[in-house]
Interface confidence: low
């Protein structure tokens, strides 16, 4: 029989959980063979010397969400078997030197969501087997050189949500085994060249939500194994030509929410594994030829909410696998007829909230798999004959909020819309803007004879029928593009909670969670 403190529950004596506001000190006696101890949501304010002395077999210790503000240096004495220690979500401002001494088996140390203002090299000098160190959500302003020098086996380090303004180029120098480094939501304004040079096994680098203005040209040149690079929501105004040149494994790159004005050809790549590129909320004004040509496997390209007024005909060369293209909320007035010619696999395109006055008749000529086209809120008065005829998979077309000119020239479009009305959705239908006597009337049901009585109206629709009729039961599944719930940022797939916020803001990119990865 192994005793269980009255304030705790002991499931199979080796697992002990002590919770509740009535607990003000570490309960005793704890079962001597306890392997897992959780002390959660209590009013414990301090840990005295050696409160766990008699449970030397302990492997996991979680002391979380308490009022803990003070720990004696010998609090964890005799816990040589401990592999996991969490002190997260407490009120710790300082850590005594030597606190982790003797924890020779410790692999995971969680100190997140406290009020730590500094760490010192001596804090972790005994933790040579540590693989994971979580320090996010504290008040750290500076990491001293040498702080992590003894943690040569560390694979995951989270320093996010602190107040770091500067990172020493030496601070990560010994972390050759590090795979995940998170520095998101700090106040970093620049990162010295060489800072990441030693991180040859790094797979994820999170630098989003800082104040980084410039990136050194060779900043990532030694990080050949990098797979996920988050640079969103910074102040980056330009990308050095070679910045992404040696990242062959990269499969996610976020650059949204910066101040990028231009993208030079070849800036991206070669990145054969990159599937998504997020560039919305920048200041990009034009897209030159071949700017994305190295991204042969790219499936999602988000360029919305920029200031793009010109797209070179070869801008999308090489994007043969692209499925989603978001160009909404830019300053486009005209598009070259060949601009989408290479996008043979494109399924969804959003062009809403631009200034498009007309579209070339061949604009979608080679893009036979298009399922959704968003053209609402432009300056379109008419569309070329047969522009959608070959798009047999088209299931969502948005044309509202354009100044449609309902004269006799609109008839072919009107007749096609009549046959394909369900594709337009039920939320808002296109309405006439001119002539004045039909302004506000539905384009689909407008009587063109009333609008322009002097013009002869052919009795037979001149707009060819498409390959199928609007029988709603036969529509393809449109959930993947149903602009109902959208993301302001791609889901940055952290295992621990960081900064990702899902919102119902419909204005971001005209595509949905299903595409966000």
């Amino acid at each position: 029989y192994y005793g269980c403190p009255s304030e705790c529950t002991c499931s199979r004596a080796s697992q002990v959980e002590c919770t509740g506001a009535r607990i003000v000190a570490v309960p005793t006696p704890l079962p001597w063979n306890a392997m897992s101890l959780q002390i959660l949501n209590t009013h414990i304010t301090e840990l005295s010397e050696s409160p766990f002395l008699n449970i030397s077999a302990l492997i996991a210790l979680r002391i979380e969400k308490n009022e803990l503000s003070h720990i004696m240096p010998g609090a964890f004495r005799n816990l040589g078997s401990l592999r996991y220690l969490s002190l997260a979500n407490n009120k710790l401002q300082v850590l005594p030197i030597g606190l982790f001494q003797g924890l020779d088996s410790l692999e995971s140390l969680l100190l997140s969501s406290n009020q730590l203002v500094q760490i010192q090299p001596a804090h972790f000098s005994q933790c040579s087997n540590l693989k994971e160190l979580q320090l996010h959500g504290n008040h750290l302003e500076y990491i001293p050189d040498g702080a992590f020098d003894h943690l040569v086996g560390l694979t995951k380090l989270n320093l996010g949500k602190n107040s770091l303004t500067h990172i020493s180029p030496r601070v990560f120098q010994h972390l050759g085994n590090l795979q995940v480094l998170r520095l998101y939501e700090n106040r970093l304004t620049d990162i010295p060249m060489g800072t990441f040079d030693g991180l040859v096994n790094l797979q994820e680098l999170a630098l989003q939500q800082n104040q980084i203005g410039l990136l050194s040209p060779g900043l990532f040149h030694n990080n050949h194994n990098l797979q996920r690079l988050y640079l969103s929501n910074n102040h980056i105004s330009q990308l050095p030509p070679s910045i992404f040149m040696q990242l062959p494994q990269l499969n996610r790159l976020t650059l949204f929410g910066n101040s990028l004005k231009e993208l030079s050809p070849g800036i991206f790549g070669p990145m054969p594994n990159l599937r998504e590129l997020w560039l919305y909320d920048n200041h990009i004004t034009s897209l030159p030829d071949n700017v994305f040509s190295n991204l042969r496997q790219l499936q999602v390209l988000i360029l919305s909410r920029n200031q793009i007024s010109f797209i070179s005909p070869g801008a999308f060369n090489g994007l043969t696998e692209l499925r989603e293209l978001s160009l909404h909320t830019n300053a486009l007035q005209d598009l070259d007829g060949n601009v989408f010619r290479m996008l043979a696999n494109l399924q969804n395109i959003s062009l809403q909230n631009n200034r498009l006055r007309q579209l070339p008749g061949n604009i979608f000529a080679n893009v036979n798999g298009l399922m959704t086209i968003q053209l609402q809120n432009n300056q379109l008065e008419n569309l070329p004959l047969g522009i959608f005829d070959h798009l047999g998979k088209l299931c969502e077309l948005r044309l509202y909020d354009n100044p449609w000119r309902c004269d006799s020239d609109i008839l072919p479009l009107r007749n096609w819309l009549l046959l394909n009305q369900p594709r337009l959705g039920t939320d808002t239908v296109p309405v006439c803007f001119s002539p004045a006597n039909v302004r506000g009337q539905s384009l689909i049901i407008i009587n063109v004879n009333v609008a322009v009585p002097s013009v002869h109206v052919p009795e037979v629709p001149s707009y060819p029928e498409t390959s199928w009729y609007p029988d709603t039961s036969s529509y393809p599944d449109t959930t993947s593009i149903s602009s109902t719930t959208e993301l302001t940022s791609p889901v940055e797939d952290y295992t621990d909670l960081t900064t990702i916020q899902v919102t119902d803001d419909r204005s971001v990119w005209g595509m949905t969670q299903a595409q966000s990865g």
């Epitope: 040569v152 180029p169 050759g176 010295p192 060249m193 060489g194 040079d197 040859v200 030694n222």
Partner: antibody
Framework: QVQLQESGPGLVKPSETLSLTCTVS????????WSWIREASGKGLEWIGY???????NYNPSLKSRVSISVDTSKNQFSLRLKSVTAADTAVYYC??????????WGQGTLVTVSS | EIVLTQSPSSLSASVGDRVTITCRAS??????LAWYQQKPGKVPKLLIY???TLQSGVPSRFSGSGSGTDFTLTVSSLQPEDVATYYC?????????FGQGTKVEIK
């Protein structure tokens, strides 16, 4: 006591490849970085590059196209190769322990002359 | 790359004199600066790192100061064994760069 010792030929012909090895004793090559630095007569010190025990490298851009540094952790050694040498590469070559910047231990240096 | 400019390029002083060498960086490097002493025919020796931290075993008459772009190495009382060339070195931003050196002689 940490010691570094350079070895390799003292004479190399123009257009050939200069090869040097640095043997580290008294310290594990698995900690810190390991650099090569050279000193040409009357020219001061020039950092060539460093290597990490994992194989990661960083080179001086002025030499990058010609230089390669490798590491052999089993022998506690690291090596320098400099291709297509000219007389301008004649110098004393030092290996040093690089604590990511400051070089706290240096080899004695070896003079390499490039001449036909 | 960061360029370090030392001044003077050479100086001559008497034993017991206070000697000052300056090093200016072409851009801010915080305190990531080291000083080395190289005696004739010998290997460079680390004197000071982090701009002002004395390396173990270095006599206390040597001191360093500065941050950003301007740095100083001071020998409070010059000794005969201090005859050498002194180099500053940037380690804020790779490539690591050295100043051109300051040669110190005894009058």
């Amino acid at each position: 006591q940490v010691q570094l010792q350079e070895s390799g030929p003292g004479l190399v012909k123009p257009s050939e490849t200069l090869s040097l090895t640095c043997t580290v004793s008294g310290a594990s090559i698995n900690i810190y970085y390991w650099s090569w630095i050279r000193e040409a007569s009357g020219k001061g010190l020039e950092w060539i590059g460093y290597v990490h025990h994992s194989g990661g490298t960083n080179y001086n851009p002025s030499l990058k196209s010609r230089v390669s540094i490798s590491v052999d952790t089993s022998k506690n050694q690291f090596s320098l190769r400099l291709k297509s040498v000219t007389a301008a590469d004649t110098a004393v070559y030092y290996c040093a322990r690089d604590t990511y910047g400051p070089f706290d231990y240096w080899g004695q240096g070896t003079l390499v002359t490039v001449s036909s | 790359e960061i360029v370090l400019t030392q001044s003077p390029s050479s100086l001559s002083a008497s034993v017991g004199d206070r000697v000052t060498i300056t090093c200016r960086a072409s851009q801010g490097i915080s305190n990531y600066l080291a000083w080395y002493q190289q005696k004739p025919g010998k290997v460079p020796k680390l004197l000071i790192y982090a701009a002002s931290t004395l390396q173990s075993g270095v006599p206390s008459r040597f001191s360093g100061s500065g941050s950003g772009t301007d740095f100083t190495l001071t020998v409070s009382s010059l000794q005969p064994e201090d005859v050498a060339t002194y180099y500053c070195q940037n380690y804020y931003s790779a490539p690591w760069t050295f100043g051109q050196g300051t040669k110190v002689e005894i009058k």
